[in-house]
């Protein structure tokens, strides 16, 4: 999944309801799996920010070696730096672990730009601010990498939380979360609350800032407002979902919904941006430009290159439209919509501005591998990865950045027919199977 702007490579609503509103379903909360309610020990266990990823503290080996690990729902390997690297403050030292077992097998993961390679083994792993368990998990010990680790990011490895189908070198390598569920009584569910800064942070502030929460084994009610709406996981490889409609400030992009999911749509905490297929991106930008036409911005801004700066505190949020994605619902012909604000899709960038300036990058970008709902989307919502029931839940995040006029929203239900037709069926040739968005 590390294509384009994958992190390790670096980067009140208008609009009529769609058709008739359906009657409210029975409250979904009685049906949720896993432990309910409070997970105090896991709240605020993530640090970081959207531009460099969100990481959780983990320990590996015996005695335990503490590392910060990027939380990535767009890949399926647990991989950690295991050799000195200029950007790493620390790394996994296998020779110091009495519980390390060598699998005598290498792994090589190339990206569009960059790569990592390493040696496979297993060791004991735990999450200090997570469930009170220790599991034996597969670990890729990264011995060589290029454009993978990020200078100053403060993480030393990656926790791939997606399914075995996209694990490297092949799907026989059990991902960490599968091992966790198999070896413990922890329910097969986790949830993420990523809290974007909303304003530029200097390096001191960034290191001290709380980034959010990864709740393992359930849902924490304190992390969201309103109700959770669920969309089916279409296929268990990436966390693939189906988008059925896209609106900019309530205006339908009016595209064949297959275009929105060409060649897939995934939820990926390891990607910074909201990435859209070329045709969709072009239509969306045209619509966003039209909605914000009282100002004109350079082409480089819409390409995610140039930064637009305003005097501190004067960012004109109101001129930028909201973006709504309608997702397939759990009930036939029913959808719901998630709506993000410019506070999510204009990403604050530190270092370039003076203290008197607020500078932003446009964090919607073009993709050749389908829609990627990255941190830009996730920072608006509490996202539940309900693997047990093959569904992903969205609710308004208690920590999302907004203003006094608009807030991110999750709303439904809406009547939407023929949603199954919105999914793109990737041709299953030998070649395409080998190339699932990796090389």
């Amino acid at each position: 999944t590390h294509l384009g702007i994958r992190l390790p490579l670096r980067s009140g609503l208008a609009g009529p309801p769609l058709g008739l509103r359906l009657p409210r379903e029975t409250d979904e909360e009685s049906e949720e799996p896993g432990r309910r309610g409070s997970f105090v020990e896991m709240v605020d266990n993530l640090r970081g920010k959207s531009g460099q990823g969100y990481y959780v503290e983990m320990t590996v080996g015996s005695p335990p070696q503490t590392l910060n690990i990027l939380v990535d729902t767009g890949s399926s390997n647990f991989a950690v730096g295991a050799a000195p690297h200029p950007f790493l403050h620390r790394y996994y030292q296998r020779q110091l672990s009495s519980t390390y077992r060598d699998l005598r097998k290498g792994v090589y993961v190339p990206y569009t730009q960059g790569k990592w390679e390493g040696e496979l083994g297993t060791d004991l792993v735990s999450i200090p601010h997570g469930p009170n368990v220790t599991v034996r998990a597969n670990i890729a010990a990264i011995t060589e990498s290029d454009k993978f680790f990020i200078n100053g990011s403060n993480w030393e490895g990656i926790l791939g939380l997606a399914y075995a189908e996209i694990a490297r070198p092949d799907d026989s390598l059990e991902p960490f979360f599968d091992s966790l569920v198999k070896q413990t009584h922890i329910p097969n569910i986790f949830s993420l609350q990523l809290c974007g800064a909303g304003f530029p942070l200097n390096q001191t502030e960034a290191l001290a800032s709380v980034g959010g929460s990864m709740i393992i084994g359930g849902i924490d009610h304190s992390l969201y407002t309103g109700r959770l709406w669920y969309t089916p996981i279409r296929r268990e490889w990436y966390y693939e979902v189906i988008i059925v409609r896209v609106e900019i400030n309530g205006q339908d992009l009016k595209m064949d919904c297959k275009e929105y999911n060409y060649d897939k749509s995934i939820v990926d905490s390891g990607t910074t941006n909201l990435r859209l297929p070329k045709k969709v991106f072009e239509a969306a930008v045209k619509s966003i430009k039209a909605a914000s036409s009282t100002e004109k911005f350079p082409d480089g801004f819409w390409l995610g290159e140039q930064l637009v700066c305003w005097q501190a505190g004067t960012t004109p949020w109101n001129i930028f439209p909201v973006i709504s994605l309608y997702l397939m619902g759990e009930v036939t012909n029913q959808s719901f919509r998630i709506t993000i604000l410019p506070q999510q899709y204009l990403r604050p960038v530190e270092d370039v501005a003076t203290s008197q300036d607020d500078c932003y990058k446009f964090a919607v970008s073009q993709s050749s591998t389908g829609t990627v709902m990255g941190a830009v989307i996730m920072e608006g919502f509490y996202v539940v990865f309900d693997r047990a029931r093959k569904r992903i839940g969205f609710a308004v995040s208690a920590c999302h950045v907004h203003d006094e006029f608009r807030t991110a929203a999750v709303e439904g239900p809406f009547v939407t027919a023929d949603m199954e037709d919105c999914g793109y069926n990737i041709p299953q040739t030998d070649e395409s199977t080998l190339m699932t968005g990796r090389a």
Epitope: T294, E295, K296, P298, G300, F301, Q306, D351, V352
Partner: antibody
Framework: QLQLQESGPGLVKPSETLSLTCTVS??????????WGWIRQPPGKGLEWIGS???????YYNPSFKSRVTISVDTSKNQFSLKLSSVTAADTAVYYC????????????WGRGTLVTVSS | EIVLTQSPATLSLSPGERATLSCRAS??????LAWYQQKPGQAPRLLIY???NRATGIPARFSGSGSGTDFTLTISSLEPEDFAVYYC??????????FGGGTKVEIK
């Protein structure tokens, strides 16, 4: 051919407001393709951006001027203006108006400039 | 804040010689960099934009190169009218705002 011409008093007293106008000929301030900007150059020194304006009246200012600067546009007269309040001797400079073109990222056409001296 | 540092401050050359002017950014500005020429008593004139594109009417002896943090303006063979002050300007941060301190090209 598009031309820009600055006009306004060459001498302003300290604490008063400096007011300059840029008249655009051979083109239009209502074009959607350009911003319009003011840059100044103190004697013997480098260039300093003051601010820019779009046809809609949307403005961007150099934060170092804080709240002293106001730029406005009058598309009916094909003019845009600069007001800089509470001036001091440090504001003595040649003031240029310019068109922001080439993807609204560079100053591609400039006026000839006008020297404004702040002195009592 | 992105700072542009130009070097040398002064370049003393003779007509017909090759001039190489440097502009270094304190952090990457991609290719969002321009060069201007300013003759005494005149307004600046845009020479190069987006690091390497010549503006309308600019002679071919002027060329720009570089990306990221290091940029070069080259005048392949100095003409008498080329003796002037040259400024670089970045527009990675928009609106365009930051100029370098200038390099004076004078007759040796």
């Amino acid at each position: 051919q598009l031309q820009l011409q600055e006009s306004g008093p060459g001498l302003v007293k300290p604490s008063e407001t400096l007011s300059l106008t840029c008249t655009v000929s051979g083109g239009s301030t209502s074009s959607s393709s350009y911003y319009w900007g003011w840059i100044r150059q103190p004697p013997g020194k480098g260039l300093e951006w003051i601010g820019s304006i779009y046809r809609s009246g949307s403005t961007y200012y150099n934060p170092s001027f804080k709240s002293r600067v106001t730029i406005s546009v009058d598309t009916s007269k094909n003019q845009f203006s600069l007001k800089l309040s509470s001036v001091t001797a440090a504001d003595t400079a040649v003031y240029y108006c310019a068109r922001v073109g080439h993807g609204i990222s560079y100053f591609d056409l400039w006026g000839r400039g006008t020297l404004v001296t702040v002195s009592s | 804040e992105i700072v542009l540092t130009q070097s040398p401050a002064t370049l003393s050359l003779s007509p017909g010689e090759r001039a190489t002017l440097s502009c270094r950014a304190s952090q990457s500005v991609s290719s969002y960099l321009a060069w201007y020429q300013q003759k005494p008593g005149q307004a600046p004139r845009l020479l190069i934009y987006d690091a390497s594109n010549r503006a309308t009417g600019i002679p071919a002896r002027f060329s720009g190169s570089g990306s990221g943090t290091d940029f070069t303006l080259t005048i392949s063979s100095l003409e008498p009218e080329d003796f002037a002050v040259y400024y670089c300007q970045q527009s990675l941060t928009w609106p365009p705002r930051t100029f370098g301190g200038g390099t004076k090209v004078e007759i040796k």
